[in-house]
């Protein structure tokens, strides 16, 4: 019969022969010949191969460097990589997360609109008018102004979008 | 067509070094592992030492072969080779070049190896 | 190193005879086990590969089973051209790669 030119899905072309890919998490160590099939063997401790393939070496799991911030959020396995994370208050620095950076804070007069994740910074925006923050955070929302009459007072002193109005009590009238 | 062709058996005295080579043709050499098995006069077979394909191709031994014997390939030539150091009577043997290293699919004719004084 | 110990080292026996050699691993070896047949002055020829698929071209008689430590040939039905060596080759697999052959198996005729 004539050699093939092109093989099925999960195969490979190879001396005019079509092969078995190795499955996932197994590496190539020979061909197929016409007497046996492809020749595969796992990946090693701290390897991987996530396709069907014909590599002669498995790639070795991301290592989640504590020193740049990282931790193993998922452990790899044979046939996917381990996937990193940041610790606590800091957050990835590229889709790769392949190192962190502390979550920014929100200035006085910005709040917390969006919470930092492992993979995404603090997103702040500017207190509207009638709400205001007056620290620098990477959690606080701004906080709206003390309403003085539902206390009974009066504005003394104007809010702003970093400060908190000052309520007084009302002045007397007098006889 | 497919096929291993070894060479470089000779008669030596004990100590003396020799290369054996595995010269492959028929097949992409490398993404193939290759093993080295010997067999001495009326015995059994007994595996010497395997290579990984690819660039790297990580080299294991038999036990009693590591340090004196070396498996290594050169790519662009499509060749095997075994150097074989500090040689002794007990590694007379014939030595086959196969393709593979958990099934042989593929051996070579074999070559002659005589230690001897 | 792994030992892989074949039994027996010589049968004798008649064609159309069922024949069985056993090869057992020192340790685990998963399904990495071959049979080989060897005919005097020739190189070894493969007839089962992973412990138990058959190497194309060799006689459906064939056949081979086991996993882990111990492993089986089986011969269904002897023929002429059987008598030989036969061989197993296990391969542990794992932070190394070590191969090592049985002893080998001589078949005679009886």
């Known amino acids: 019969p004539e050699p093939p030119t092109a093989c099925r899905e999960k195969q490979y072309l190879i001396n005019s022969q079509c092969c078995s890919l190795c499955q996932p998490g197994q590496k190539l160590v020979s061909d197929c010949t016409e007497f046996t099939e492809t020749e595969c063997l796992p990946c090693g401790e701290s390897e991987f191969l996530d396709t069907w393939n014909r590599e002669t070496h498995c790639h070795q799991h991301k290592y989640c460097d504590p020193n740049l911030g990282l931790r193993v959020q998922q452990k790899g396995t044979s046939e996917t990589d381990t996937i990193c994370t940041c610790e606590e208050g800091w957050h990835c620095t590229s889709e790769a997360c392949e190192s962190c950076v502390l979550h920014r804070s929100c200035s006085p007069g910005f709040g917390v609109k969006q919470i930092a994740t492992g993979v995404s910074d603090t997103i702040c925006e500017p207190c509207p008018v009638g709400f205001f923050s007056n620290v620098s955070s990477a959690f606080e929302k701004c906080h709206p102004w003390t309403s003085c009459e539902t206390k009974d007072l009066v504005v003394q002193q104007a809010g702003t979008n970093k400060t908190d109005v000052v309520c007084g009590p009302q002045d007397r009238l007098r006889a | 067509e497919v096929q291993l062709e070894e060479s470089g058996g000779d008669l030596v005295q004990p100590g003396a070094s020799l290369r054996l080579s595995c010269a492959a043709s028929?097949?992409?050499?490398?993404?193939?592992?290759m093993s080295w098995v010997r067999q001495a006069p009326g015995k059994g077979l007994e595996w010497v030492a395997s290579?990984?394909?690819?660039?790297?191709?990580?080299?294991y031994y038999a036990s009693w072969a590591k340090g004196r014997f070396t498996i290594s390939k050169d790519t662009s030539k499509t060749t095997l080779y075994l150097q074989m150091n500090s040689l002794r009577a007990e590694d007379t043997a014939t030595y086959f070049c196969?393709?593979?290293?958990?099934?042989?699919?593929?051996w070579g004719q074999g070559t002659l190896v005589t230690v001897s004084s | 190193d792994i030992q892989m110990t074949q039994s027996p080292s010589s049968l004798s026996a008649s064609v159309g005879d069922r024949v069985t050699i056993t090869c057992q691993a020192s340790?685990?070896?998963?399904?990495?086990l071959a049979w080989y047949q060897q005919k005097p002055g020739q190189a070894p020829k493969l007839l089962i590969y992973?412990?138990?698929k058959l190497a194309s071209g060799v006689p459906s008689r064939f056949s081979g089973s086991g996993s882990g430590t111990d492993f089986t040939l089986t011969i269904s039905s002897l023929q002429p051209e059987d008598f030989a060596t036969y061989y197993c080759?296990?391969?542990?697999?794992?932070?190394?790669?070590?191969?090592?052959f049985g002893q080998g198996t001589k078949v005679v005729i009886k």
């Open positions: 196969a393709r593979g290293i958990t099934r042989l699919p593929l």
């Open positions: 028929g097949f992409d050499f490398n993404s193939n592992a």
């Open positions: 290579i990984y394909a690819g660039g790297s191709g990580s080299t």
């Open positions: 340790q685990s070896i998963s399904s990495y």
């Open positions: 992973d412990a138990s």
């Open positions: 080759q296990g391969t542990y697999y794992g932070s190394t790669t070590i191969s090592a």
